[in-house]
């Protein structure tokens, strides 16, 4: 799991323990088995923008 | 260039250990995992485990789960493999392997290999 | 784990000529990505493997394009258009869907 009190990964990456980085999840086409692709395939897509407040 | 530089081979009794080693240049060590594989004479190709050498997390075969033993020095970019209760089986060449986890190109570099001979 | 098996396992081939191995797999490398995650390997006599096509057809760097790699979901084949001398060793497909990453038996290609 992610260290408490790190800033989360940015959008289109996920943390991954065995690195201790964040990782860009277009390198789970190298390697679909990486422990921070199941982070990526989780992800929501992108949150859309209320009309409202 | 990137490069992967084994140690040299060796020659044990049965019941004795050996450490490998195997020396990355070339390209950040802690960026790519270093595999291990196993190749017996005139036998094909078995993979004994994995270490990402930033973190030392380890990944192994549960056929090699107890026999080998993988661990990686980042001051020196050096991975290395040991192989404990030898037995005549554990003659081998054991290969270590760059794999990359980046996009979409599993780039493999392969060091040349280092002969294990276990003999009484 | 995955079961990959290799046929031929020798494979006499003449130099000029096609040759063609195939590689099954016990369980599909095809992800949802739409990747088969199976890759080529060939070992010169007296030397580490090196990588020939890595996601079913594509080339590594490198790589003469006489080489070519097909198939889908369990069942593969590498072809050399036409063959040469330094073609010779042993070539293994293998996997790389998940752990443990295993291997063909490997198919000894040699010269008649």
């Known amino acids: 799991e992610q260290a408490p009190g790190t800033a989360p990964c940015s959008r289109g990456s996920s943390w991954s323990a065995d690195l201790d980085k964040c990782m860009d999840c277009a390198s789970c086409r190298a390697r679909p088995h990486s422990d921070f692709c199941l982070g990526c395939a989780a992800a929501p897509p992108a949150p859309f923008r209320l009309l409202w407040p | 260039q990137v490069q992967l530089v084994q140690s040299g081979a060796e020659v044990k009794k049965p019941g004795a250990s050996v450490k490998v080693s195997c020396k990355a240049s070339?390209?950040?060590?802690?960026?790519?995992?270093i595999a291990w594989v196993k190749q017996a004479p005139g036998q094909g190709l078995e993979w004994i485990g994995e270490?990402?050498?930033?973190?030392?997390?380890?990944y192994y075969s549960e056929k090699f789960r107890g026999k080998a033993t993988l661990t990686a020095d980042t001051s020196t970019s050096t991975a290395y493999m040991e192989l404990s209760s030898l037995r005549s089986e554990d003659t081998a060449v054991y290969f270590c392997?760059?794999?990359?986890?980046?996009?979409?190109?599993?780039?493999?570099?392969w060091g040349q290999g280092t002969l294990v001979t276990v003999s009484s | 784990d995955i079961v990959m098996t290799q046929s031929p396992l020798s494979l006499p081939v003449t130099p000029g000529e096609p040759a063609s191995i195939s590689c099954r797999s016990s369980?599909?490398?095809?992800?949802?990505?739409?990747?088969?995650?199976l890759y080529w390997y060939l070992q010169k006599p007296g030397q580490s493997p090196q990588l020939l096509i890595y996601?079913?057809?594509n080339r590594a760097s490198g790589v003469p394009d006489r080489f070519s790699g097909s198939g889908s979901g369990t069942d593969f084949t590498l072809k050399i258009s036409r063959v040469e001398a330094e073609d010779v060793g042993v070539y293994y497909c293998?996997?790389?869907?998940?752990?443990?990453?295993?291997f063909g038996q490997g198919t000894k290609v040699e010269i008649k």
């Open positions: 996601q079913m057809s």
């Open positions: 293998a996997h790389n869907l998940e752990l443990p990453w295993t």
């Open positions: 270490i990402y050498p930033g973190t030392g997390r380890t």
């Open positions: 070339g390209y950040t060590f802690t960026d790519f995992i």
């Open positions: 392997a760059r794999r990359t986890i980046y996009y979409d190109y599993d780039g493999d570099y």
């Open positions: 369980q599909s490398l095809l992800h949802s990505n739409g990747i088969n995650y």
